[in-house]
């Protein structure tokens, strides 16, 4: 015998989900035990089976789903699955807002990323906050040099993607640079993207020799390219 | 060569439905937001509709809202518009427009490349 | 929702002369990130539109030199320094910061 566990726990890891009024919304609690478990969902605490709501809910047992139809605001809230068997129980809450503004391209703060000194050797942090309507993809890319030249016969930079994430509304977004040299100087550009469009702004990270004891955290002007 | 290649227009009484199919080619349709944009014989150029690469983000013109449903196949580089409850007012040539797309944009985010279009005419 | 407002209704240009239009927009198209998402297009009699200018002022590739797109926040102007023939057409402005994304109500560029 076994107490449920989560068998894709990767599928679960948005917590929160930002939609447009009209979206179909799906959430999944993929799980397993012994004896099989089974699933009943919860909204704000209370036990829900979209009885009234308009268009209902589709429950599917087997893909540990529930599955609402065109959202509307009186669809925000909490939403739990509880997994149980005789051994013992699990449960995780998903949070659904339903937005009604217009949507809009993503809004990056500004100053961020910022500008950022290092010592070689030391780890570096750059922030991305976004503001967004709908879920953003996030890319972090870095400016490179190819052949000498740091744009292409196009005009435009070449870059190297670093990381690339998917995160919620408001969220901020991290690069990691850890043990940095040399090499990592330059410049390195938050890229914001969603159904409307993209957004994206720059930073230059300047990297002085680890001997140098002089070094101050004034940093280069801000250079953001088109 | 970067395509898009509407079908699927035609006459339809009012309160009937249609579906209009968008099919790409020459670029990486699964990372691209897709709209449809009209254009009233003789009018201006109206949005209509975007959905988002993946499919799960959509947002629609207040005039189509609840009637008009877009969708699309990344396995077989589709976009569609399901048409519902049409109306006079909807006669239009339909244009399928590429979006947004994932990553650096060389160039504009979207709304470089436009389909020939689609004509729909809503008539008793 | 934006609104964008197109003038002049019609233009009547002599080839080789200088053609303006101008756009107003009902918010500021001037984004977080700096730039400016006001797009420009011509669309020629039974195709659909193509893109002149985007991002304010950046020219499309393949966009002859002759046009040029300029402004600020609300007021936006699209300029061809020498009309030719070929340049006839409906031009819209548009503006791509938020849905509905929403167009001018177009200018008719004719030859005299």
């Known amino acids: 015998q076994q107490a449920p566990y989560w068998t894709h726990p990767q599928r679960m890891e948005k917590k929160l989900h930002a939609v447009p009024a009209g979206n179909t919304v799906k959430f999944r609690c993929p799980a397993a035990g012994n004896p099989t478990p089974t699933i009943r969902w919860l909204k704000d605490g209370q036990a829900f089976h979209g009885e009234n709501r308009i268009g209902g809910i589709r429950l599917r047992h087997q893909h540990w789903s529930l599955v609402m139809e065109s959202v509307v605001p009186s669809d925000r809230g909490t939403y739990t699955c509880l997994v149980e068997n005789a051994v013992g129980s699990i449960r995780y809450n998903y949070l659904l807002d339903v937005l009604e503004r217009s949507p809009h391209r993503p809004i990056l703060q500004a100053g961020l990323p910022a500008n950022t000194t290092a010592v070689v050797g030391s780890d570096v942090e750059l922030l991305c906050k976004v503001y967004s309507d709908a879920q953003p993809h996030i890319q972090w890319l870095k400016h490179i040099v190819i052949n000498g030249s740091s744009f292409g016969a196009d005009g435009f930079p070449y870059v190297q993607v670093l990381k690339t994430a998917d995160i919620n509304s408001s969220e901020v977004e991290v690069l990691y640079l850890r043990n940095v040299s040399a090499e990592d100087a330059g410049e390195y550009t938050c890229l914001a993207g969603n159904s409307i469009g993209l957004s994206y702004q720059s930073a230059w990270l300047t990297v002085l020799p680890e001997e140098d004891p002089t070094w101050t955290a004034a940093a280069p002007e801000a250079r953001y390219t088109d | 060569e970067v395509q898009l290649l509407e079908s699927g227009g035609g006459v339809v009484q009012p309160g009937r439905s249609l579906r209009l199919s968008c099919a790409a080619s020459g670029f990486t349709f699964s990372s691209y937001a897709m709209h449809w944009v009209r254009q009233a014989p003789g009018k201006g150029l109206e949005w209509v509709a975007v959905?988002?690469?993946?499919?799960?983000?959509?947002y629609y013109a207040d005039s189509v809202k609840g009637r008009f449903t877009i969708s699309r196949d990344n396995s077989k580089n589709t976009l569609s518009l399901q048409m519902n409850s049409l109306r006079v007012e909807d006669t239009a040539i339909y244009y399928c427009v590429r979006g947004a797309g994932l990553g650096w944009p060389y160039g504009p985010d979207g709304f470089d490349i436009w389909g020939q279009g689609t004509m729909v005419t809503v008539s008793s | 929702d934006i609104v964008m407002t197109q003038t002049p209704l019609s233009l009547s240009v002599t080839p080789g002369q200088p053609a303006s239009i101008s756009c107003t927009s009902s918010?500021?198209?001037?984004?977080?990130?700096?730039?400016?998402?006001v797009y420009w297009y011509v669309q020629k009699s039974g195709q659909p539109p193509q893109l002149l200018i985007y991002e304010l002022s950046n020219r499309f590739s393949g966009v002859p030199d002759r046009f040029s797109g300029s402004g600020s926040r609300t007021d936006f102007t699209l300029k061809i320094s020498r009309v030719e023939a070929e340049d006839v057409g409906v031009y819209y402005c548009?503006?791509?910061?938020?849905?509905?994304?929403?167009f001018g109500g177009g200018t008719k560029v004719e030859i005299k």
């Open positions: 959905i988002s690469y993946d499919g799960s983000n959509k």
């Open positions: 918010r500021s198209l001037l984004h977080s990130d700096g730039k400016t998402y």
């Open positions: 548009m503006q791509y910061v938020e849905a509905p994304l929403t």
